[in-house]
C-alpha cells in the first residue's frame, strides 16, 4: 500500500479513491461505482448509443472515442462555424453542401447535377441513362436493342449518341408523304426492275426481290463460265449448243455431218427462232437415225456411247430452246417416226398428259418448274424409235431385288441373254433439270410389239455412265403391268425410257390371277 493512502492496483482508465478503492475515469464505467478489487475493469461508455443523453442535432453524426465522443457533420454537410467537431446540439452549425456548385463536372457528360440534402443526383439528358455500375455516369440508351422497337418493320433502327433514327432499308424508299429518319418513317420496297434503277446486263432479266433485285439469264441463255446466275453482276451468253459436240474417240462421217448441222443452227440461233430451231434439230436427228450410215459399222459399245451422247444432248438443248416458246401445246412428227410433244405454260396446278403415237406421259405440273424460276414451265416428250438401232444389245443392270425376282419367277436367261427392246425409246424432260427425285411420280404408257407369251417385260431408263456411255437400268422405275401390246411404267425420276422384254422363261404362273375366259 501507498504511504499516502492510495491503492496501487487500480485497473486501467481508473483513479484511486483511497488505499482500498478506485473509481473509473470520466467516460468509463464499471460494474459498481467504487472498485474494490483489482479484478474489475473500466469500460468505455458509448455516448453515441441510442439511449444516451448526448444529442448532436440534425445533419450530424455522433462518433464515439475512448473515454469521450465527438459530433461531426454528416457527409454532404459542413459546419458554418468551421469547427470540425462539437459536443452537443447547441454547438451544431451543420448545413448542406451544394456539391453541384463546388464541382460542375460531377455528372460528367450527358448529365445534369441536381443538389439534394446531403448529396446530389445526376439527371441524364433524353436518350441517356445512368450506368448501373457507376450511378454518376450517364451512358447512351441504345433504343434499337432495348426491346422498345421504336421503328416500323419496313425500316432499320440506327442508334445515335442520345437518339436514334429509323432509316429505310437498302433497296427501300419512304412511302409517299413519309419522312426518312424520324420514328414515324414508313418505307416500301423499291422495284429496281420497273424503276430502271437496276444494273442488270442486257443478257439477263431483272427480277425484283424484297429490298433488292437479281439478274437472271434470259430463257435459253446460260451464265458465262465461272459467273453464277441470279446475281447483280450475272452476265449470260446465248446457249449456242456449244456442249453438244461429237463424243470423243468416235469416228463417223454421218455423226460429224449431224453435229455440223447442230453447230450451224447454234450460230444462227436467236430466241425468236426457238420453234424453227427445235424442228430443224429433230429433223436432222430423224434423218441421222433413219440412215445411220457408218454409225452401224461401229463396235456395239461405241454405238451405245453415241446413243447416250445423243439422248443427253438432245434433252439439254430441247430444255433450253423450249423456254423461249410461247404458251401452248406443240406436236411435231417426222418421217422416220421421231415425235415431239411439248407443253409450255405459266405454272398451273394440275396434271399434264402428253400423248403420242406410241407413248403417253402423265405427271404433275408442279414438277416442271424450279421454285423461283421466272420462266415458263415446260414438259416435253420425245419418241425416238430410230435410237433402237444404236441401242441394240445394250446391257441391262438390274437392282439386286429385281434380279432375285426374275430368277425366282423364271427358269433363267435363255439364248444370248440380251433383253429385247419392245418399245420406242422416249426421252422426257422438264424446264426444271433437277429431275432425279420427283416428289410425285411420272407414269408412262407404252404401246409396243406383242410380248412373247410367258416372257416378262421391264420398264427401264437409260443410265448415262461416267465413261460417257451407259446401260439400261430399273432403279426408281416400277412396271405397273403389261397386257399384250401395252405396258405402264411408274418412275420417280426423268431420263430416257423404254420397255424391254427379258429373255427369261417363266417358271410358274400365279394360279390366283389366271384368267377365266
Amino acid at each position: 500500500q501507498d504511504s499516502r493512502g492510495c491503492a496501487r492496483w487500480c485497473p486501467q482508465d481508473s483513479s484511486c479513491v483511497n488505499a482500498t478503492a478506485c473509481r473509473c475515469n470520466p467516460g468509463f464505467s464499471s460494474f459498481s461505482e467504487i472498485i474494490t478489487t483489482p479484478m474489475e475493469t473500466c469500460d468505455d461508455i458509448n455516448e453515441c448509443a441510442t439511449l444516451s443523453k448526448v444529442s448532436c442535432g440534425k445533419f450530424s453524426d455522433c462518433w464515439n472515442t475512448e473515454g469521450s465522443y465527438d459530433c461531426v457533420c454528416s457527409p454532404g454537410y459542413e459546419p458554418v462555424s468551421g469547427a470540425k467537431t462539437f459536443k452537443n446540439e447547441s454547438e451544431n452549425t451543420c448545413q448542406d453542401v451544394d456539391e453541384c456548385q463546388q464541382n460542375p463536372r460531377l455528372c460528367k457528360s450527358y448529365g445534369t447535377c441536381v443538389n439534394t440534402l446531403g448529396s446530389y443526383t445526376c439527371q441524364c439528358l433524353p436518350g441517356f441513362k445512368l450506368k448501373p455500375e457507376d450511378p454518376k455516369l450517364c451512358t447512351d440508351v441504345n433504343e434499337c436493342t432495348s426491346g422498345q422497337n421504336p421503328c416500323h418493320s419496313s425500316t432499320h433502327c440506327l442508334n445515335n449518341v442520345g437518339s436514334y433514327q429509323c432509316r429505310c432499308r437498302p433497296g427501300w424508299q419512304p412511302i409517299p408523304g413519309s419522312p426518312n429518319g424520324p420514328n414515324n418513317t414508313v418505307c416500301e420496297d423499291v422495284d429496281e426492275c420497273s424503276s430502271g434503277q437496276h444494273q442488270c446486263d442486257s443478257s439477263t432479266v431483272c427480277f425484283n426481290t424484297v429490298g433488292s433485285y437479281s439478274c437472271r439469264c434470259r430463257p435459253g441463255w446460260k451464265p458465262r463460265h465461272g459467273i453464277p446466275n441470279n446475281q447483280k453482276d450475272t452476265v449470260c451468253e446465248d446457249m449456242t449448243f456449244s456442249t453438244w459436240t461429237p463424243p470423243p474417240g468416235v469416228h463417223s462421217q454421218t455423226l460429224s455431218r449431224f453435229f455440223d448441222k447442230v453447230q450451224d443452227l447454234g450460230r444462227d440461233y436467236k430466241p425468236g427462232l426457238a420453234n424453227n430451231t427445235i424442228q430443224s434439230i429433230l429433223q436432222a436427228l430423224d434423218e441421222l437415225l433413219e440412215a445411220p450410215g457408218d454409225l452401224e459399222t461401229l463396235p456395239r459399245l461405241q454405238q451405245h456411247c453415241v446413243a447416250s451422247h445423243l439422248l443427253d444432248g438432245l434433252e439439254d438443248v430441247l430444255r433450253g430452246l423450249s423456254k423461249n416458246l410461247s404458251n401452248g401445246l406443240l406436236n411435231f412428227s417426222y418421217p422416220a417416226g421421231t415425235e415431239l410433244s411439248l407443253e409450255v405454260q405459266k405454272q398451273v396446278d394440275r396434271s399434264v398428259t402428253l400423248r403420242q403415237n406410241q407413248a403417253v406421259m402423265q405427271l404433275d405440273w408442279n414438277q416442271a418448274q424450279k421454285s423461283g424460276d421466272p420462266g415458263p414451265s415446260v414438259v416435253g416428250l420425245v419418241s425416238i424409235p430410230g435410237m433402237g438401232k444404236l441401242l441394240a444389245e445394250a446391257p441391262l443392270v438390274l437392282e439386286p431385288e429385281k434380279q432375285m425376282l426374275l430368277h425366282e419367277t423364271h427358269q433363267g436367261l435363255l439364248q444370248d441373254g440380251s433383253p429385247i427392246l419392245l418399245s420406242d425409246v422416249i426421252s422426257a424432260f422438264l424446264s426444271n433439270n433437277d429431275t432425279q427425285n420427283l416428289s410425285s411420280p411420272v407414269t408412262f404408257t407404252f404401246s409396243h410389239r406383242s410380248v412373247i407369251p410367258r416372257q416378262k417385260v421391264l420398264c427401264v431408263f437409260w443410265e448415262h455412265g461416267q465413261n460417257g456411255c451407259g446401260h439400261w437400268a430399273t432403279t426408281g422405275c416400277s412396271t405397273i403391268g403389261t397386257r399384250d401390246t401395252s405396258t405402264i411404267c411408274r418412275c420417280t425420276h426423268l431420263s430416257s425410257f423404254a420397255v424391254l422384254m427379258a429373255h427369261y422363261d417363266v417358271q410358274e404362273e400365279d394360279p390366283v390371277l389366271t384368267v377365266i375366259t
Epitope: S351, T353, V360, Q362, L363, D364, E399, P400, E401, K402, M404, L405, E408, T409, S439, S440, P441, V442, T443, T445, K456, S478, T479, I480, G481, T482, R483, S486, I488, R490, D510, V512, L513
Partner: antibody, heavy 121, light 111 residues
Framework: EVQLVESGGGLVQPGGSLRLSCAAS????????MHWVRQAPGKGLVWVSR????????NYADSVKGRFTISRDNAKNTLYLQMNSLRAEDTAIYYC??????????????WGCGTLVTVSS | QSALTQPASVSGSPGQSITISCTGT?????????VSWYQQHPGCAPKLMIY???YRPSGVSNRFSGSKSGNTASLTISGLQAEDEADYYC???????????FGGGTKLTVL
Amino acid sequence: EVQLVESGGGLVQPGGSLRLSCAASGFTFRSYWMHWVRQAPGKGLVWVSRISSGGSTTNYADSVKGRFTISRDNAKNTLYLQMNSLRAEDTAIYYCARGDNYYDSPYFDYWGCGTLVTVSS
Amino acid sequence: QSALTQPASVSGSPGQSITISCTGTSSDVGGYNYVSWYQQHPGCAPKLMIYEVSYRPSGVSNRFSGSKSGNTASLTISGLQAEDEADYYCSSYTSSSTYVVFGGGTKLTVL
C-alpha cells in the same frame, strides 16, 4: 393356302405410336409386293402404303406420309407398319394385302382379316 | 370424299342383273386399264372379283363381269343370288402420288 394375319392393333392416345405386323404364309413372301389398306368404321377402303418384294421401294398415301413407315422382314415372312404421331382420323381397321409377284400392279388378290386401331384420348 | 364415285346403294331381285358404276378422271379410270372390283361382306376382308377392268381371278363366278367406257368403269352381276348381297368397291391405278384410289363403296341389296 395363302394366309395373312395382322396383329398389333389397339387403343392409343393421339400423338402415340403403334407397330402393326402381318404374318404371311402359304406363298413365297419375298417375291411379292405387299400393301396396307385401311377402312374407318362404316366407311370405304383407303390405300395406305406399299413396299416392293425386296423392300427397296416404298410409297405412302399423302395423309400418312412422314408419320407411317412400311417395312418387311423376308426372313420372318412378316410385313410391318410403324405408325407414329397418330391422329383420331387414323382410327380404322388396317388390312394387310398381297400385290403382284412381279409387276407393281394396283390390285390385291389376298387380304388379311384386319386389325383395329383406335386413336382416342 | 372418295376419289372415285360410286352409287351408295343398288338393289335387285334374285335372278336379275344389276350394274354398279365407278366414275373417275383421265388420271385414273380413264387413263389406265387398271380398274379392280372388290366384294366385302359385313365383318369380313375384301375379296378381289375383277382386275384390269374385265379379268376374273380363278374361283370367281362368271356371273361377275367388268367393263370400261371413258372415265367410267362398270361391274355387272347377272343372275343375282342372295350371297351376292355385300358392299362392292372399285379401285383404279392413278398417276398421282397416291398410286391407287378406291370408290366410296356401293351396298348391294338382294330383295
